[in-house]
């Protein structure tokens, strides 16, 4: 079973926007990662593999992202600062099988005027 | 390709709550059905099969539901009556393959005081 881990920073700030990092195990080869704000899907990224070493990335919501072998980071330029919102990552694992879906670590994000600080409670 | 169909009533009222019916083809054996209000996931039901005929039902959002061989009905006790909301069903098909995701029929639901009438526009 895969759970979120508190050993990474889920939120970080860059140029007035926020980067939200969704970690996954390095053993996962094909996956879908979704970022939720409360229960709203903000971003979705799917990585699948071809017969060779080719990788296909689908990003239907056109989010800015960075993909590594153990995390997907989404970049939100205008996070909702009206109130603290709860963000969490949802991981669908296609490979290795069997198919699994897991909600990963989440946290409350409070945006202040400077957008350089956040009050964060990790949910494990 | 699977699309929503207008040959069923998506909304019906019972005991002050609303039943929202999400149809799917009878050929689908393993699936996930999600109910959205706008972009918010209200309910989610996953049906998978084991090696024998055992069926596993996962209902992580603890919605009241009824599952048949061609529909999932979700029961909302306190639908948002502050304004008309757009509800739609999203179907993920695991079996038979290939994996597919489809948005099914949707409609605008306007709740009146009596909760016995709704103004509905089906989206096909």
């Amino acid at each position: 079973e895969i759970n979120g881990s508190a050993d990474h920073r889920m939120f970080s700030f860059h140029n007035g926007g926020v980067q939200i990092s969704c970690k996954y195990p390095e053993t996962v080869q094909q996956l879908k990662m979704r970022l939720f704000r409360e229960r709203e899907v903000l971003c979705e990224l799917t990585k699948t593999k071809g017969s060779g070493n080719a990788v296909s990335i689908k990003n239907p919501m056109l989010c800015l992202y960075h993909l590594s072998n153990n995390s997907v980071s989404f970049f939100l330029n205008n996070p909702d600062s009206s109130q603290g919102s709860y963000y969490f990552c949802s991981l669908s694992i296609f490979d290795p099988p069997p198919f699994q879906e897991r909600n990963l670590s989440g946290g409350y994000l409070h945006i202040y005027e400077s957008q350089l600080c956040c009050q964060l409670k990790l949910w494990l | 390709e699977i699309n929503g169909s207008a040959d069923h009533r998506m909304f019906s009222f019972h005991n002050g709550g609303v039943q929202i019916s999400c149809k799917y083809p009878e050929t689908v054996q393993q699936l996930k059905m999600r109910l959205f209000r706008e972009r918010e996931v209200l309910c989610e039901l996953t049906k998978t099969k084991g090696s024998g005929n055992a069926v596993s039902i996962k209902n992580p959002m603890l919605c009241l539901y009824h599952l048949s061989n061609n529909s999932v009905s979700f029961f909302l006790n306190n639908p948002d009556s502050s304004q008309g909301s757009y509800y739609f069903c999203s179907l993920s098909i695991f079996d038979p393959p290939p994996f597919q995701e489809r948005n099914l029929s949707g409609g605008y639901l306007h709740i009146y005081e009596s909760q016995l009438c709704c103004q509905l526009k089906l989206w096909l």
Epitope: Q30, T48, G50, S51, G52, A54, S56, K58, S92, F94, D95, P96, P97, P98, F99 | Q30, F94, D95, P96, P97, P98, F99, Q100
Partner: antibody
Framework: EVQLVESGGGLVKPGGSLRLSCAAS????????MHWVRQAPGKGLEWVGV??????????YYSDLVKGRFTISRDDSKNTLYLQMNSLKTEDTAVYYC????????????WGQGTLVTVSS | DIQMTQSPSSLSASVGDRVTITCQAS??????LSWYQQKPGKAPKLLIY???LLAEGVPSRFSGSGSGTDFTFTISSLQPEDIATYYC????????FGPGTKVDIK
């Protein structure tokens, strides 16, 4: 009902060419990786090659035994897979199967019943 | 290319017997190994994928185990309808089949 039906097999002389077809129905052909596998009379199964889906730019990969001589192609609009075989050798004599595979999120594969190719003078 | 070896090449067993076939890969293939059953004049049928996961509709008397380079396929109680040739196949890098194991009844 899922069906894969191979056709185009027959007798051909060494050095000759042949084109096999595989007509698919009952599933979303364009979502599947399509392989050719062959089996010489009384022998085991041997993978020939594969063509990936549009998401992977229809990439093709071949076994060393056929590389440079065989070409796999597909027409998603016709739900059809092809195998163009050139410079045929007697050791290419086999039943040729087309197979469809998918692994996301569950692993499935479908096989045709095969078509016999005989290379002989 | 990854090479696959299988043993034994053939075996005879009685109905109800436990049958075991081994498969070895020339390099680490993680768990990307499947097992097929082929009856004379028929196309192969997928039984097991990813080393130990049963394909849809396959009886539970079939099972698989292993990881890396060494794998095992087991029929817990041989039935008359299990008479066939069994192949392992790696799909870690393209596809390669083992040479097959012919199973028949004593």
């Amino acid at each position: 009902e899922v069906q894969l039906v191979e056709s185009g097999g027959g007798l051909v002389k060494p050095g000759g060419s042949l084109r096999l077809s595989c007509a698919a129905s009952g599933f979303t052909f364009s979502d599947y990786f399509m392989h050719w596998v062959r089996q010489a009379p009384g022998k085991g199964l041997e993978w020939v090659g594969v063509i990936d889906t549009k998401s992977f730019n229809y990439a093709t990969y071949y076994s060393d035994l056929v590389k440079g001589r065989f070409t796999i192609s597909r027409d998603d609009s016709k739900n059809t897979l092809y195998l163009q075989m050139n410079s045929l050798k007697t050791e290419d004599t086999a039943v040729y199967y087309c197979t469809a595979t998918i692994a996301v999120p569950y692993y499935f594969d479908y096989w045709g019943q095969g078509t016999l190719v005989t290379v002989s003078s | 290319d990854i090479q696959m070896t299988q043993s034994p090449s053939s075996l005879s067993a009685s109905v109800g017997d436990r049958v075991t076939i081994t498969c070895q890969a020339s390099q680490d293939i993680s768990n990307y190994l499947s097992w097929y059953q082929q009856k004379p004049g028929k196309a192969p049928k997928l039984l097991i994928y990813y080393t130990n996961l049963l394909a849809e509709g396959v009886p539970s008397r079939f099972s698989g185990s292993g990881s890396g380079t060494d794998f095992t396929f087991t029929i817990s109680s041989l039935q008359p309808e299990d008479i066939a040739t069994y192949y392992c196949q790696q799909y870690y890098n393209y596809r390669t089949f083992g040479p097959g194991t012919k199973v028949d009844i004593k």
